[in-house]
């Protein structure tokens, strides 16, 4: 492939669409290519033929959009930056190219939260009192924020605090929330312990 | 001058084959596809195939594969047409010509090859 | 593939006539994909007109094209003796591409 390559940015774990601009009408056959500096060659990807359906050469990782040309990375990863070469043969034989040179970084952005797991125990007191420990566990807590609600009011903001201590009624009817967040997306889970401290005899354990 | 020559005519032997040249001048040579044609005496014109010297890439008339091979060198600028199981059909001048860049017409045509195929 | 009919086969036109000949095409293509060659005995067809309507490098004025879909048309406004010569419909909006069987032009 030759002439200059249009530069196309992204950040990994996202689609990324490779478009040709101006592409003849007349298309025979179309092949996808990625260079290997390594061994100074270029690597199949995909073909097309006209009327047939594309052959993916590499893995379901990439597909082929016929009605532009487009060669589709549909999660890209950093090792998928590199230069990419799109060559299409018109049905008279001329061929034509096309060049991508991908850069594909790191987001900064972490990834979505999981939904986190919400466990604990408790303990039955005397005076119809019922007193609970709460956990709430995600296993990737990087940049994450916690936030307990009991029913719909909040009643912890301390975005560290991962466990939560509560002295309630017996028979009261309880309803507890953990919500994790990030800059990105937010999961909860909530838990219902007016059975668990009913039902109790002095120590009991509640789990999702 | 963009220049098309081509090898001289031949008479051969029914089952034989023939290896016809078409030497190209006056342009970038990998920039350009080349195609043949065939004529019969007194007939009209028909496409056997095209070579693209830039990506060898070859094509053939479905009526041609397994009659025509089409090469190309290009040290030489040079395209080359096999024909092979020769019958008295295959007698006829044969034209190495240019496919225009942009759009898909014979541009310049050599001065053909006569194949004469006769026991 | 794409039949190509050229019409008449012959025809014979007196110096100074205005002739036209006739491409059909069995299917419809697009204009820039139709052309014209011209062919004199003992000699090499030669592009005369491409795309429908543009003449070649070298051809005189007093030829033009026209036409779309399956209906194509070389016409010469005024018969010259060096026209006399067989005319070729040529089309490469598929493949293969193919040719008219010719219409030969001979001076009345």
């Known amino acids: 492939c030759q002439g200059s390559a249009d530069h196309v940015v992204s950040i990994s774990g996202v689609p990324l669409q490779l478009q040709p601009n101006s592409i003849q009408t007349k298309v025979d056959s179309i092949a996808w290519k990625k260079l290997l500096p390594s061994q100074n060659g270029f690597h199949h990807i995909l073909k097309w033929e006209n009327g047939s359906l594309p052959s993916n050469t590499s893995n379901d990782r990439f597909s082929f959009i016929v009605k532009n040309l487009s060669l589709l990375i549909k999660a890209a990863q950093q090792q998928d930056s590199g230069l990419y070469c799109l060559e299409v043969t018109s049905i008279s034989g001329k061929v034509q190219t096309a060049t991508f040179q991908v850069f594909v970084f790191e987001s900064l952005l972490p990834d979505k939260v999981e939904k986190p797991r919400l466990q604990g125990q408790g303990k039955i007191l005397d005076r119809g009192r019922c007193q609970v420990a709460l956990s709430c566990l995600v296993s990737r807590d990087g940049n994450v924020s916690y936030a307990w609600y009991r029913g719909s009011k909040l009643i912890q903001t301390a975005g560290n605090l991962t466990y939560l201590d509560e002295e309630v009624d017996i028979n009261g009817t309880h309803t507890y929330t953990c919500n994790v967040s990030n800059p990105v997306s937010w999961e909860s889970h909530t838990l219902n312990l007016t059975q668990d401290c009913q039902n109790a005899h002095q120590e009991f354990r509640f789990w999702p | 001058e963009v220049q098309l020559q081509q090898s001289g005519p031949e008479l051969v032997k029914p089952g034989t084959s023939v290896k016809m040249s078409c030497k190209a001048s006056g342009y970038t040579f990998t920039n350009y596809v080349l195609d043949w044609v065939k004529q019969k005496p007194g007939q009209g014109l028909e496409w056997i195939g095209y070579?693209?010297?830039?990506?060898?890439?070859?094509k053939y008339n479905e009526k041609f594969k397994g009659k025509a091979t089409l090469t190309s060198d290009k040290s030489s600028s040079t395209v080359y047409m096999d024909l092979s199981s020769l019958t008295s059909e295959d007698s006829a001048v044969y034209y190495c010509?240019?496919?225009?860049?942009?759009?898909?017409?014979?541009?310049?045509w050599g001065q053909g090859t006569t194949l004469t195929v006769s026991s | 593939d794409i039949v190509m009919t050229q019409s008449p086969p012959i025809i014979s036109a007196s110096l100074g006539e205005r002739v036209t000949m006739t491409c059909t095409a069995s299917s419809s293509i697009s204009s820039s994909d139709l052309h014209w060659y011209q062919q004199k005995p003992g000699s090499s067809p030669k592009l005369w007109i491409y795309s429908t309507s543009n003449l070649a490098s070298g051809v005189p004025v007093r030829f033009s094209g026209s036409g779309s879909g399956t209906s194509y048309f070389l016409t010469i406004s005024s018969m010259e003796a060096e026209d006399a010569a067989t005319y070729y419909c040529h089309q490469y909006h598929r493949s293969p591409p193919t040719f008219g069987g010719g219409t030969k032009l001979e001076i009345k």
């Open positions: 070579i693209n010297p830039y990506n060898d890439g070859i």
């Open positions: 010509v240019r496919l225009g860049y942009d759009e898909d017409y014979f541009d310049y």
